[in-house]
């Protein structure tokens, strides 16, 4: 399903082979913090890849001298705001003391603020994009990423967090928003929605999209995701819409074929090295940019938030493997893990591109209500 | 200390068996994937086969697939190449090598074994 | 004939700075595929120089540094010692022969 203006050339318009597999924000490893209770310590807990909190888990960005290379990350509890009350409602809870947020759910009590204060913050995410309003800023350049080829060996840790599917990543990928931000990639994960209700959590004028990936980015100013966490520009996350395509996407088949090896929350299995790259859309020059927070407690803000215009296809199939797989807590299907859109609160979403120009013959002239605030740094 | 350990190398007849091993020590030999390496005399090195942390996934090079097997026993720290079918051009000094980090780098190698088939 | 290209021998004078090539495809090397170097000396094993392109192990003198760029990499040697005199070889991987490989090697010589 596209938004009527989404050609190949409009805003989001045109899946791309390139897929996306976003994991969740909701835990962010730090890479420091004491391993979860998930993963107890053993041979595989080596030192340098610690557990953060955060969108889904982050990484920590310390190689690690384990095997397949993987960093470890710490589940972090995503709390969300009240959104529109069709949309799932995040709310975290904890059953452990202290600030713990490492369990949490989509739903339910307590509200996430009550996890995490952050989560009630004016500048969270995700948000509702409407390229009209968009700010099309020239300074924009393409996103430049590096390393994110990868051997079949060391393989990858995949694992059910008990809220989404999280890929962990080897250290050496890195990612450049532009000249002097650069950052190293963490983790992906994903969130997607159940039979005929998308799962997106950013939504483009109110249309709700399949499925999107993220992929969680460390700055390299930072050494540890908690050093990062509410710093502005500490964290970065570069997300895809996943939309229902003719073709099987082989990119995203590697890991979808393996989602029945860790239907269990809290499971998690090794897969072959691959092409991360290929989880996103092929074009990285058109996207829309702003600054928000962790979609999951701890909600952190200050979060470089980068949505692709172009969207990732995958077949129906593969979209209802992502949704009809896992289990969450409880003996519930993990499904709806998305948390409400938020408000912009006067922020600004700018695009690399001039998306609030209508490409249908219909638009006489240019609608750009809102100008570049960025210099490009 | 961290070390791989070789054995198993020696003379045999084209057509015939040999099984090398690889003894690890001084690291978590269960959480990392590990390759076979050879080096003809005098040649360059030739990646042979790899496998990965659990064993359950298995690569090999075009020369050696269907006559060579490689496994691994976790339980005893040890890499195993089973070479069947051996030819002249498989007369190598063999290596075990770990390569389950640096992003597919072999960082620990074993000392090397000598292969040679010869009627 | 090796996947990675390198030449058989490159020379310099103590002291002196000489670089060695490493050339591949757009199926290793240009496919954003990490380059390794390792060193060998006469009757051992090779040893891991530089990873992921550019990242020198512990142990490494800072002497050696590596770099890649397109479809090529090279390896670098300043203040060219007289053990040094020894081989070095490139290593990828390669997506279309779903396989590590190696370049030839390099007999590095200090005259």
């Known amino acids: 399903q596209r938004l009527p203006r989404m050609q190949e050339d409009s805003p989001l318009g045109g899946g791309s082979s390139g897929e996306d597999d976003p994991l969740g924000e909701e835990d962010l490893p730090s890479e420091e913090d004491s391993p979860r209770e998930e993963d107890p310590p053993g041979e595989e807990d080596l030192p340098g890849e610690e557990d953060l909190p955060g969108e889904e888990d982050l990484p920590e960005v310390k190689p690690k001298s384990e095997e397949e290379g993987s960093l470890k990350l710490e589940d972090l509890p995503t709390v969300e705001a009240p959104g529109d009350p069709q949309e799932p409602q995040n709310n975290a809870h904890r059953d452990k003391e202290g600030d713990d947020q490492s369990h949490w759910r989509y739903g339910g009590d307590p509200p996430w603020p009550r996890v995490s204060p952050a989560c009630a913050g004016r500048f969270q995410s995700p948000v509702d994009i409407r390229p009209q309003l968009a700010a099309f800023c020239p300074a924009l350049r393409p996103l430049e990423l590096l390393g994110f080829q990868l051997p079949p060996l060391p393989e990858l840790r995949l694992r059910n967090n008990g809220h989404s599917v999280q890929l962990t990543l080897p250290p050496g990928l890195e990612m450049a928003l532009g000249p002097g931000r650069e950052y190293r990639a963490l983790q992906l994960h994903l969130h997607w929605g159940a039979a005929g209700r998308p799962g997106s959590e950013h939504t483009v004028e109110g249309h709700r999209f399949p499925a999107e990936i993220h992929v969680v980015h460390l700055s390299t100013a930072f050494a540890r995701v908690d050093e990062a966490l509410g710093r502005p520009g500490g964290l970065a996350v570069l997300a895809a819409f996943l939309e229902e395509g003719p073709e099987e996407n082989s990119a995203y088949e590697q890991l979808l074929s393996r989602l029945e090896e860790i239907a269990e929350e809290g499971s998690e299995t090794q897969v072959p090295g691959l092409d991360i790259s290929a989880l996103l859309p092929s074009d990285f020059s058109r996207y829309f940019q702003y600054e928000g927070s962790l979609t999951t407690p701890p909600c952190a803000q200050g979060v470089i938030w980068t949505v692709f215009n172009q969207t990732v296809m995958l077949s129906a199939k593969q979209l209802h493997t992502l949704s009809d797989t896992l289990w969450g807590p409880g003996d519930s299907r993990l499904q709806l893990n998305f948390r409400a859109t938020q408000p912009l609160n006067g922020r600004v979403i700018e695009a690399s591109f001039p998306a609030g120009v209508d490409s249908s013959p219909r638009a006489a002239e240019p609608v750009q209500l809102n100008s570049c605030l960025a210099a490009g740094d | 200390q961290v070390q791989l350990v070789q054995s198993g190398g020696g003379v045999v007849q084209p057509g015939g068996s040999l099984r090398l091993s690889c003894a690890a020590s001084?690291?978590?030999?269960?959480?990392?994937?590990m390759s076979w390496v050879r080096q003809a005399p005098g040649k360059g090195l030739e990646w042979v086969s790899a496998i990965s942390a659990n064993g359950g996934t298995t690569y090999y090079a075009d020369s050696v697939k269907g006559r060579f097997t490689i496994s691994r026993d976790n339980s005893k720290n040890t890499l195993y190449l089973q070479m069947n079918s051996l030819r002249a051009e498989d007369t190598a000094v063999y290596y075990c090598a770990n390569n389950g980090n640096y992003r597919g780098a072999f960082d620990i190698w074993g000392q090397g074994t000598m292969v040679t088939v010869s009627s | 004939q090796s996947v990675l290209t390198q030449p058989p021998s490159v020379s310099g004078a103590p002291g002196q700075r000489i670089t060695i090539s490493c050339t591949g495809s757009?199926?290793?090397?240009?496919?954003?595929?990490?380059v390794h170097w390792y060193q060998q000396l006469p009757g051992t094993a090779p040893k891991l120089l530089i990873y992921a392109n550019n990242n020198r192990p512990s142990g490494v003198p800072d002497r050696f540094s590596g770099s890649k760029s397109g479809t090529s990499a090279s390896l670098a040697i300043t203040g060219l010692q007289a053990e040094d005199e020894t081989d070095y070889f490139c290593q990828s991987y390669d997506s279309s022969l779903s396989a590590w490989v190696f370049g030839g090697g390099t007999k590095v010589t200090v005259l």
């Open positions: 001084g690291f978590p030999f269960s959480s990392y994937a």
């Open positions: 757009r199926s290793n090397i240009g496919a954003d595929y990490d």
